[in-house]
C-alpha cells in the first residue's frame, strides 16, 4: 500500500523520497518565505483502516514572508498548466537520447513511466526504485513549481509539490 502524492501547501514545496506506508516527509518553504512558528512541516503516509486507503496527514505548515530573506528571489507565481501539452522544461544536457524505462542506466537511477491523467499538473506517484509512475494532474494552487506541466513531477524516489488526486500505481534554473 502506498500513498498518492501529498497535497500542495501554499508557498511550500516537497520532494517525496518514499510513498510507502508510515514514510515521513517534510515540506520546505519557498525562497523568501519561512515557516511560521508553531506550525509543522511534517507529513506522514498513514492508513485509514476504515477504507484501507493510504493518505498523507495534513501538515499544519504555514509559510509566511520572511523579511530577512528579501535578497533571495521569491517564488515565481504559479501558472495553470494543461494536461496533454508536451512539457518543455530547461535542458540540462544536450543529449537527445531517450532513456529506456525498463532499464535504468545506472544503479543510482530510478525510472518510471508517466501516464498523464487529464485535468491537472503532472504528478507521479511512487517511491525509489524502478517502477511505473502514473501521473495525475492538478492545477497548482500556489507559488511552488509551475512554469511547465512537467516541472512539478516527482519521481520514483521523490515527489514534489504533488497535489491530491494522484493515483499511486508505481510511484515516482537557472541562476
Amino acid at each position: 500500500i502506498t500513498c498518492p502524492p501529498p497535497m500542495s501547501v501554499e508557498h511550500a514545496d516537497i520532494w517525496v523520497k518514499s510513498y510507502s506506508l508510515y514514510s515521513r516527509e517534510r515540506y520546505i518553504c519557498n525562497s523568501g518565505f519561512k515557516r511560521k512558528a508553531g506550525t509543522s512541516s511534517l507529513t506522514e503516509c498513514v492508513l485509514n483502516k476504515a477504507t484501507n486507503v493510504a493518505h498523507w496527514t495534513t501538515p499544519s505548515l504555514k509559510c509566511i514572508r520572511d523579511p530577512a530573506l528579501v535578497h533571495q528571489r521569491p517564488a515565481p507565481p504559479s501558472t495553470v498548466t494543461t494536461a496533454g501539452v508536451t512539457p518543455q522544461p530547461e535542458s540540462l544536457s544536450p543529449s537527445g537520447k531517450e532513456p529506456a524505462a525498463s532499464s535504468p542506466s545506472s544503479n543510482n537511477t530510478a525510472a518510471t513511466t508517466a501516464a498523464i491523467v487529464p485535468g491537472s499538473q503532472l504528478m507521479p506517484s511512487k517511491s525509489p526504485s524502478t517502477g511505473t509512475t502514473e501521473i495525475s494532474s492538478h492545477e497548482s494552487s500556489h507559488g511552488t513549481p509551475s512554469q511547465t506541466t512537467a516541472k512539478n513531477w516527482e519521481l520514483t524516489a521523490s515527489a514534489s509539490h504533488q497535489p491530491p488526486g494522484v493515483y499511486p500505481q508505481g510511484h515516482s534554473d537557472t541562476t
Epitope: 514545496d13 520532494w15 519557498n30 525562497s31 533571495q72 528571489r73 517564488a75 515565481p76 508536451t86 512539457p87 518543455q88 522544461p89 530547461e90 535542458s91 540540462l92 544536457s93 543529449s95 537527445g96 537520447k97 531517450e98 532513456p99 524505462a101 535504468p104 542506466s105 545506472s106 543510482n108 537511477t109 530510478a110 525510472a111 518510471t112 513511466t113 508517466a114 501516464a115 498523464i116 503532472l122 507521479p124 525509489p128 509512475t133 501521473i135 507559488g143 511552488t144 513549481p145 509551475s146 512554469q147 511547465t148 512537467a150 516541472k151 512539478n152 513531477w153 516527482e154 519521481l155 520514483t156 524516489a157 521523490s158 514534489s160 509539490h161 515516482s172 534554473d173 537557472t174
Partner: nanobody, 122 residues
Framework: EVQLVESGGGLVQAGGSARLSCAAS????????TAWFRQTPGEQREVVAI???????SYADFVKGRFTISRDNAQDSVYLQMNGLKPEDTAIYYC????????????????WGQGTQVTVSS
C-alpha cells in the same frame, strides 16, 4: 551511462564556506528538477534545497539564508553554496535530479549521486 558526481566536500572550520558541485553526464532528455539532500548517521535523508525547472527555489529551515542552490546549464552542473557552516551541518550531501524523456507520454527519471562528505569542525 548516467552519472552524477558530487565534489567539494571535506573538512571546513565552523563559520567557513564550501561549494558543492554535482556534475551530470549522460543525462537523457531534459532536466526537470534538481535538489540537494543530506544525511547524518542514523538519520533519514533530509531535503536541503529544491530548484524547480522553472526557477522556483525552496530551502529547508535549517539552511535558510546560508545555503544557495544554483545551476549551470552550460556545464551540466548543479551547485550548493554553503556559507556560515555549523558543526551540525556535518553530513553526507547528495544531489538528485529529475528528467523526463521527449516522447509522449513522457517517462520520468530520477538520478542520485553517491554523496560527498562535509565535516564542519568547531
Amino acid at each position: 551511462e548516467v552519472q552524477l558526481v558530487e565534489s567539494g566536500g571535506g573538512l571546513v572550520q565552523a563559520g567557513g564556506s564550501a561549494r558543492l558541485s554535482c556534475a551530470a553526464s549522460g543525462i537523457p532528455g531534459t532536466l526537470n528538477d534538481t535538489a540537494w539532500f543530506r544525511q547524518t548517521p542514523g538519520e533519514q535523508r533530509e531535503v536541503v534545497a529544491i530548484r524547480r525547472s522553472g526557477g522556483n527555489i525552496s530551502y529547508a529551515d535549517f539552511v535558510k539564508g546560508r545555503f544557495t542552490i544554483s545551476r549551470d546549464n552550460a556545464q551540466d552542473s548543479v551547485y550548493l553554496q554553503m556559507n556560515g557552516l555549523k558543526p551540525e551541518d556535518t553530513a553526507i550531501y547528495y544531489c538528485a535530479i529529475a528528467v523526463f524523456s521527449r516522447d509522449f507520454p513522457p517517462k520520468r527519471y530520477e538520478y542520485w549521486g553517491q554523496g560527498t562528505q562535509v565535516t564542519v569542525s568547531s
